[in-house]
Each structure stands twice: as C-alpha cells, then as structure tokens.
C-alpha cells in the first residue's frame, strides 16, 4: 500500500485522523518539507531577540538580536552582550583588555599584541586596549648608514620564486 | 532535571527592600530568560520581571521603579531586589524558567511566602 | 485587574467536557501563541498547554488548547476528580515586552 503521506508537500502535514489527508499547517506552525506527518511550532522572537524574518507555513521564523546584543549559536540562538571596543565579556560582565592585549570589536575576546621582535621588526605604533601594535622595518633598516632613499622590494606572489 | 530554588527571608519590613535569589540546578542558566512572578494570598499570578542569561532585563511597569533583577552565571542564580515594601506586597514569590524558543515558563520553584509586616 | 480575562470559576461533573475561555487584544493573545498552567493549592504553578496546543510530556491528552483572534481556550473532556484545580492563561504582550496573566479559573469537579 503507497504511503500517501509521501504526496503532502511542504506546508501541509499528513492527517492520519482524516484518512491521511494532506492538511495545511495550523497557524504558528511550518513544515520545510513533504511528507510530514506533523508540523514544527513557530519559533518566537521575543525580548532581547527580534524578528528578522517570519514564519511561514514552509519556513521557521529567524531572529536576531536587538541593538546592544549579537547573536551567538547555530541560527541566533543565543544572544550576547556586546561590549566596547578595548573590552571582553566576562561572567561578571564588559571588562577592560589587560596590559598588552587588545580587541577592536564589539564581541569576542581580548588577543595579545602582536609580538614584533618575532619576525625581526620593530614596534612602529604602540599597542591600544583597542589597536594591535604597527610593526615597522627592523632595527637594521633604520641603523644609521642605511639608506631610507632605497624603494623597498616589490612583495612576492605567493607560489612564486624569485626570478 | 533542572530545578529552581528560592531563598530569602520571610518576614520583612514595610519601606524595607526583599533581596530573593533563586539557584538553578541541573542545568545551565545559559540560553534562557528567567522570571520572577508572585501571588498574593488568593489571588492571581503577577509577572514582575525577566532577565535574559546575558543581562538583558525587562519589568512589569507597575513595578518597574522599585524593582531590580540580576544574574550570576558563575553561581548558577538570579536575584531580585524589590525596594519600598507595603503590604500590598505580601505574596507567594516564585521564580521560573521561561523557554526562549516558545516562550512558556516551563519550570518553576516551589515558591517562597514573604510577608510584609512590622 | 489582569490583562487577560478569564471567567472566575468553572465547573462540572466527572466524565463531562469543560472549556475555559481567555480573552485578550492584538498586542497579547491577537499576534502571539498562548499558554496555559495548572495550579493546585499550595503549590507552584505546572505548564500545561504551551504555543496554543502543544502538551507537554507528562500531561494528558484530555487537556487540549485552542486559540482564534485575541481569544484562547483550554478544553478538558472527560473530567475527572483529580483536574480540581486554578487554570491561567498566559501569552507575550508585545506592548509590554513580557508576558501576562488572566486572572486565573478555579474548576470545581462536582459530584
């Protein structure tokens, strides 16, 4: 015996009280796909979320977070305080970045400066609770003799030896 | 199963402030709104208001300028502060989880009598 | 005075159905789903019926819920003794940003 519940498109769900009948989605509920022999309640978009799209009888409402708050998780499903730039969020709230680290956005976590030195370079620009460091020529390049008339060398393509 | 405790005194004094905190266990406080409703003796139920996990909070107007709730995701609980208390504030105080998919506040307290006395 | 109106009591004999009604207005009931909770004495409210029609697990499929316009109601057929309760509706107001209550419905089981 054909399942006629395989019939029911996306929209409707298959009414086993009605002799499977397709039936459409009651109001607050979807179905994304056929063959469905129940329909998905609406998500809400309340409080600190707002709708950024409605339901359908085919489709989930989407949310977002309201001004102050990003989302977090899989389709917002979470929403998160957002701080100022130079701050991170902790369990006890927005927090400044420590001494030698920094965050340029609203969210997230504060990140090391970068450590010049590493690559042979100096410090051009000083760090900021909300800048990364500027990394200049090395020492070397600006010791005295050097000469800072001299272009500096075109950059390399990735994948490419020198010729 | 996640469950909700209420603690704070039961007894307080008109003008006074209620301090009532409510400790989620067995599960994360994550993710969720979490309400503070009340009910005086024989009457209905009153929502005072709601914090969301990350801070966010919202209170019934006719109680929004003397009330104050607040969450500590590293205990696991969320309090509320009620200033300037009369007798009108005598009530069962229940806290509840409220779903943040479909908005019904699926587990609650057992609740805590506080009256307001001299 | 509650936003939502329920009728204050409700009443009837073990077997029958029984319906309580919720009324509401568009910024409530009219463009958000509805809840409802049982209530027995001296104890916390339990979520009966949530987003209109939902049960969940746990509560018998006696306890149905139906929502049209800015109005709700909860229906319980077959009654039985132990259904003595106070049922409230509930459901965002979106002029509030939070939810609120009806008044509550005590049912009396006679008989």
């Known amino acids: 015996l054909q399942d006629l519940c395989s019939n029911c498109p996306a929209g409707t769900f298959c009414d086993n009280n009605r002799s499977q009948i397709c039936s459409p989605c009651p109001p607050n509920s979807f179905s994304s796909a056929g063959g469905q022999r129940t329909c998905d309640i609406c998500r809400q978009c309340k409080g600190v979320f707002k709708t950024r799209k409605e339901c359908s009888s085919t489709s989930n409402a989407e949310c977002d977070c309201i001004s102050g708050y990003h989302c977090l998780g899989a389709e917002c499903s979470m929403c998160e305080q957002d701080c100022k730039q130079g701050q991170e969020l902790t369990k006890k709230g927005c927090k400044d970045c420590c001494f030698g680290t920094f965050n340029d956005q609203k969210r997230g976590i504060c990140r090391p400066w970068t450590n010049c030195s590493l690559d042979g370079k100096s410090v051009l620009v000083n760090g900021t609770k909300e800048r990364d460091v500027v990394c200049g020529p090395s020492p070397a390049d600006l010791s005295p003799g050097a000469s800072s008339a001299t272009p500096p060398a075109p950059a390399r393509e990735p994948g490419h030896s020198p010729q | 199963q996640v469950q909700l405790q209420e603690s704070g005194p039961g007894l307080v004094k008109p003008s006074e402030t209620l301090s009532l905190t409510c400790t989620v266990s067995g599960g994360s406080i994550s993710s969720y709104y979490w309400s503070w409703i009340r009910q005086p003796p024989g009457k209905g139920l009153e929502w005072i208001g709601y914090i969301y996990y990350s801070g966010y909070t919202n209170y019934n107007p006719s109680l929004k300028s003397r009330v104050n709730i607040s969450v500590d995701t590293s205990q696991n609980q969320f309090s509320l502060k009620l200033n300037s208390l009369t007798a009108a504030d005598t009530a069962v105080y229940y806290c509840?989880?409220?779903?943040?998919?479909?908005?019904?506040?699926?587990?609650w307290g057992q609740g805590t009598t506080v009256t307001v006395s001299s | 005075q509650s936003v939502l109106t329920q009728p204050p009591s409700a009443s009837g004999t073990p077997g029958q159905r029984v319906t309580i009604s919720c009324s509401g207005s568009s910024s409530n009931i009219g463009n958000n789903p509805v809840n409802w909770y049982q209530q027995f004495p001296g104890t916390a409210p339990k979520l009966l019926i949530y987003?209109?029609?939902q049960r969940p697990s746990g509560v018998p499929d006696r306890f149905s819920g139906s929502k049209s316009g800015t109005s709700a109601s909860l229906a319980i057929s077959g009654l039985q003794s132990e259904d003595e309760a106070d049922y409230y509706c509930?459901?965002?107001?979106?002029?509030?940003?939070?939810?609120?209550f009806g008044g509550g419905t005590k049912l009396t089981v006679l008989g």
């Open positions: 509840a989880r409220t779903h943040s998919y479909y908005y019904g506040m699926d587990v």
């Open positions: 509930e459901a965002w107001d979106d002029s509030l940003n939070g939810p609120v």
């Open positions: 987003s209109n029609n």
